[in-house]
């Protein structure tokens, strides 16, 4: 067990051009406060994912009113440290999010309004018990200077706060196999208290209350020898001497995660994904409640009806997230079709359409033929951003402006001869064939295949194709 401590030194304009405007004014006095969110490991999770290691809110800072004409100075800060207690081991690597919030104190209907001024995030390695680490982070035109450390709460010591120390029983030395507790040389490292009944020969523990088995042993207290009979999905390694191991209890067996947390195995142990309102290695620490004011941007906090909903924030229009910390970007609804660019204008959504598309949601494929004429009786055919002309007989080209040779495509079948004509083409059919394209054989008895020759035309006569 221990505490992560964060000390904010300053929050103000960063170096360089483009100094930010002061967040407060004579008409709208305001004050700052900070929120820190910690997650184990070097995760790059979304800002609203659970703060599995814990979270803390600072007190509100002094009220600040901008002096007219003066650039934004470093803003007055809340007193004291932000402290995030952790119940179990300190993970050594962690991710942090530090948010600077502004509380406007004007005549707001329904109380003060909150808005997020800046959010910084990072991933760090930190041993518990070490000195304060200093950091500078920039968010836009703002700069945040802060220090942080992790310290163990007695009797825990060590870089992960997992070793326990007890006062020496004898003035001169510690018990067998136990070292003095640096830096508390007058105390001794206490033996870890494993789970009651854990086999002293075949079991060990790295944290109080657990019982981990040496190879070849299984069971909750490591008292059951591993079977060498056939097994399906060995959890341990197989060897020539032992065959394969029967799956021992996995780190998630029996779900060590409290309060509705879900367990997932990691290479070394397990990890709990905690429901909102809980944190700690096993989700056993009850976190933020409505008393902490967790809902931002005017969100209404309602105490959860059960432990896995310590609180619910009912967000005002335009905000979302577990703490109403995110402005709703309605473009995330993906309203624009056909690759249109979405713009959330606040009062309305707009889609900026790609060429060839139109409509409020870019859902209409534009009539590519609009305003484009096909010459010589051609008709325009729409086609995904480029118009095409289907030309009348005798014409060709992109806009049907070119006179075409209707016989170029050799339209007369069965050796028929083609003649260009002002209204199209004429096929003079070879003996034995008939039809506009000489496509029908003439039967020997003089009857023709369908369709019948029109009256007044003998099979073999030239036929005009109109």
């Amino acid at each position: 067990a221990g505490v992560f401590e964060l000390q904010i030194h300053s929050f103000g304009p960063g170096p360089g051009p483009g100094a930010p405007r002061s967040p407060c004014s004579a008409r709208l006095p305001c004050r700052l406060f900070f929120r820190v969110c910690l997650k184990p490991g070097l995760s790059e999770e979304a800002a609203e994912s659970p703060c599995a290691l814990g979270a803390a809110l600072s007190a509100r800072g002094p009220v600040y009113t901008e002096q007219p004409g003066a650039p934004a100075p470093d803003l007055p800060l809340p007193d004291g440290l932000l402290q995030v207690p952790f119940r179990d081991a300190w993970p050594g690597t962690f991710s942090f999010i530090i948010e600077t919030w502004r509380e406007e104190l004007g005549d707001q209907i329904g109380g003060p309004a909150w808005s997020l001024l800046a959010r910084v995030a990072g991933r760090r390695r930190l041993a518990a018990g070490g000195p304060w680490a200093r950091d500078i982070q920039r968010a836009g035109a703002w700069e945040l200077r802060f220090s942080y450390r992790a310290r163990c709460e007695p009797p825990a010591v060590g870089t992960a706060c997992t070793r326990l120390c007890r006062p020496r029983s004898a003035p001169s030395r510690c018990g067998p196999g136990l070292r003095p507790c640096a830096p508390l040389e007058d105390e001794c490292e206490a033996p870890l208290v494993c789970r009651a009944g854990c086999s002293p020969e075949h079991g060990f523990c790295e944290q109080p209350g657990e019982c981990r088995c040496l190879e070849g042993w299984t069971g909750p207290l490591c008292t059951v020898p591993v079977s060498t009979s056939s097994c399906l999905s060995p959890r341990g390694p197989s060897s020539a001497t032992t065959g394969c191991l029967v799956p021992g209890p996995g780190p998630c067996d029996g779900n060590p995660c409290a309060n509705g947390g879900s367990c997932s195995e990691t290479p070394r142990s397990f990890e709990c994904t905690c429901p909102r309102g809980f944190y700690g290695l096993r989700c056993e620490v009850s976190g933020v409640t409505c008393a902490d004011g967790p809902c931002f941007n005017g969100g209404l906090c309602v105490g959860g009806a059960d432990p896995d909903s310590a609180y619910i924030c009912h967000c005002p229009p335009g905000f979302q997230g577990s703490n109403c910390e995110k402005r709703v970007d309605r473009c995330s609804l993906q309203p624009c079709r056909n690759g249109g660019l979405c713009l959330d204008l606040g009062h309305a959504l707009r889609c900026r359409c790609r060429a060839g598309f139109a409509g409020p949601r870019c859902e209409h494929d534009l009539d590519d033929c609009a305003g484009r004429a096909c010459a010589n009786g051609g008709t325009c055919v729409e086609g995904g951003g480029a118009h095409r002309c289907s030309c009348a007989l005798g014409f060709g080209g992109r806009d049907c402006r070119e006179r075409a040779d209707p016989c170029a495509a050799r339209p007369c079948a069965h050796g028929g001869r083609c003649y260009a004509h002002f209204s199209g083409l004429v096929c003079a059919c070879a003996p034995g064939y008939m039809g506009a394209r000489c496509e029908f054989p003439v039967h020997p008895d003089g009857a023709s295949a369908l369709p019948a020759a029109p009256p007044g035309l003998r099979p073999g006569d030239p036929q005009r194709y109109l």
Partner: antibody, heavy 117, light 107 residues
Amino acid sequence: QIQLVQSGPELKKPGETVKISCKASGYTFTDYSMHWVKQAPGKGLKWMGWINTETGEPGYADDFKGRFAFSLETSASTAYLQINNLKNEDTATYFCARYDGYAMDYWGQGTSVTVSS
Amino acid sequence: DIQMTQTTSSLSASLGDRVTISCRASQDHSNHLHWYQQKPDGTVKLLIYYTSRLHSGVPSRFSGSGSGTDYSLTISNLELEDIATYFCQQGDMLPWTFGGGTKLEIK
């Protein structure tokens, strides 16, 4: 043709977890957000929220914050709804629906979830 | 949140009748009003979007109208396959909300 096919009915005990799937076909999955709607027995429709299929970012209605999680398996054109620590009041039919920029234009057939001890 | 009210929870009509189902919103929502049909087997289909636009494949006997806070769905010539529950939904402000539904039955 456009289809949303949901996984089969589920019978669960209070405290358990359920994960419902919604497999899309007939269109480009990542072009349209996917929405989830709850219908308790004999009741009306209640919008739960959505997930952006391009970024994976979810948005939840107030009554569905906490125990509910939307997720994606983009390669399989599938959206998921997971409900943790089930309660009796989670007994309902859950629908997935595609949003076309105006309305939810295509719906899954619904997945019935019964929570009973 | 915008509340959607369908005052008539059930409605009986004869085949061939002209049927109108109404829906009222607690505040104006810029015509972002949609109508859905839920058949007795549970399947849900979009009928009308953006107040009056007919979704593809929906028979032309369905039509929608309204503005501001008052909207309606009309079936001009009731057929047996129209037996269903009809829901209105506003899509202007998050969270989206549905009316309680109007169940349409045959006399």
